[in-house]
């Protein structure tokens, strides 16, 4: 089967790698433009240069193309706690992070938060914390792991998912309760 | 007690428009950067937009850019969505939610509202 192709990808099959179909005459193929530049003429001939002209400011693009107009560099998200990694040039997008001793939450493919990693109160680091996952913490006996944090076995209802856990405190506080009644 | 509630919801035909709202209580709204998130049927949770502290900086979903605007009147405590060229697609149950702080979950949600378009 023959993947469908895009009519754009359909024109720039036709000539060799690095180069693109003019649009006005599909004879000619016109060598693309070098990243951090753009298209603003396309070649006027076989063998002419085609008119690339330097991104500006506030603009780039990461790799060869022949686009009309450069992408405009993205702005890290101070709301979501996002630092700068490095700035925008002609060639590269901005790249945003998180400070030290944070971790990113991807809430979707492009958008990510920052938040603190975890210190395992009352329990130890099974899994340090990195670049886009929190770290992974066990509990201390007498606590149960909620939300990534350890909390203590006297807030655990008999419904929740820690009753496993906490087990023999459970026990404990029922047995407490069983003696007070008789 | 911290309270959402959104409304404005309903059945909506392809191509038309519907705008939400979401009344905040309980707390400094103020102070606080706002989501709108939405569960289609079946499906999970996706992120549709959000908006900092004073209305400046906005982020839209690539689903509904340039069809949706989200806005705040941080005077009636209220957060808007603002919902234009609904698709079959948008079809779902629509919640606001204040932006997480400690960690990736949501401590407040008000009940939703829910938005049909169907011709």
């Known amino acids: 089967l023959v993947p469908h192709l895009g009519d754009r990808e359909k024109r720039d099959s036709v000539c060799p790698q690095g180069k693109y179909i003019h649009p006005q005459n599909n004879s000619i193929c016109c060598t693309k433009c070098h990243k951090g530049t753009y298209l603003y003429n396309d070649c006027p001939g076989p063998g002419q240069d085609t008119d690339c002209r330097e991104c500006e400011s506030g603009s780039f693009t990461a790799s060869e193309n022949h686009l009309r107009h450069c992408l405009s560099c993205s702005k890290c998200r101070k709301e979501m706690g996002q630092v700068e990694i490095s700035s925008c040039t002609v060639d590269r997008d901005t790249v945003c992070g998180c400070r030290k001793n944070q971790y990113r939450h991807y809430w979707s493919e492009n958008l990510f938060q920052c938040f603190n990693c975890s210190l395992c109160l009352n329990g130890t680091v099974h899994l340090s914390c990195q670049e886009k996952q929190n770290t992974v913490c066990t509990c201390h006996a007498g606590f149960f792991l909620r939300e990534n944090e350890c909390v203590s076995c006297s807030n655990c209802k008999k419904s929740l998912e820690c009753t496993k856990l906490c087990l023999p405190q459970i026990e404990n506080v029922k047995g407490t309760e069983d003696s007070g009644t008789t | 007690e911290v309270q959402l509630l959104e409304s404005g919801g309903g059945l909506v035909q392809p191509g038309g428009s519907l705008r939400l709202s979401c009344a905040a209580s309980?707390?400094?709204?103020?102070?606080?950067?706002m989501v709108w998130v939405r569960q289609a049927p079946g499906k999970g949770l996706e992120w549709v937009s959000h908006?900092?502290?004073?209305?400046?900086?906005?982020y839209y979903a690539d689903s509904v850019k340039g069809r949706f605007i989200i806005s705040r009147d941080n005077s009636k405590n209220t957060l808007y969505l603002q919902m234009y060229s609904l698709r079959a697609e948008d079809t779902a149950v629509y919640y606001c939610?204040?932006?997480?702080?400690?960690?990736?979950?949501?401590?407040?949600w008000g009940q939703g509202t829910l938005v049909t378009v169907s011709s």
């Open positions: 939610a204040m932006l997480p702080k400690r960690g990736p979950r949501f401590g407040y």
């Open positions: 309980g707390f400094t709204f103020a102070h606080e950067p």
């Open positions: 908006i900092d502290r004073v209305g400046q900086d906005t």
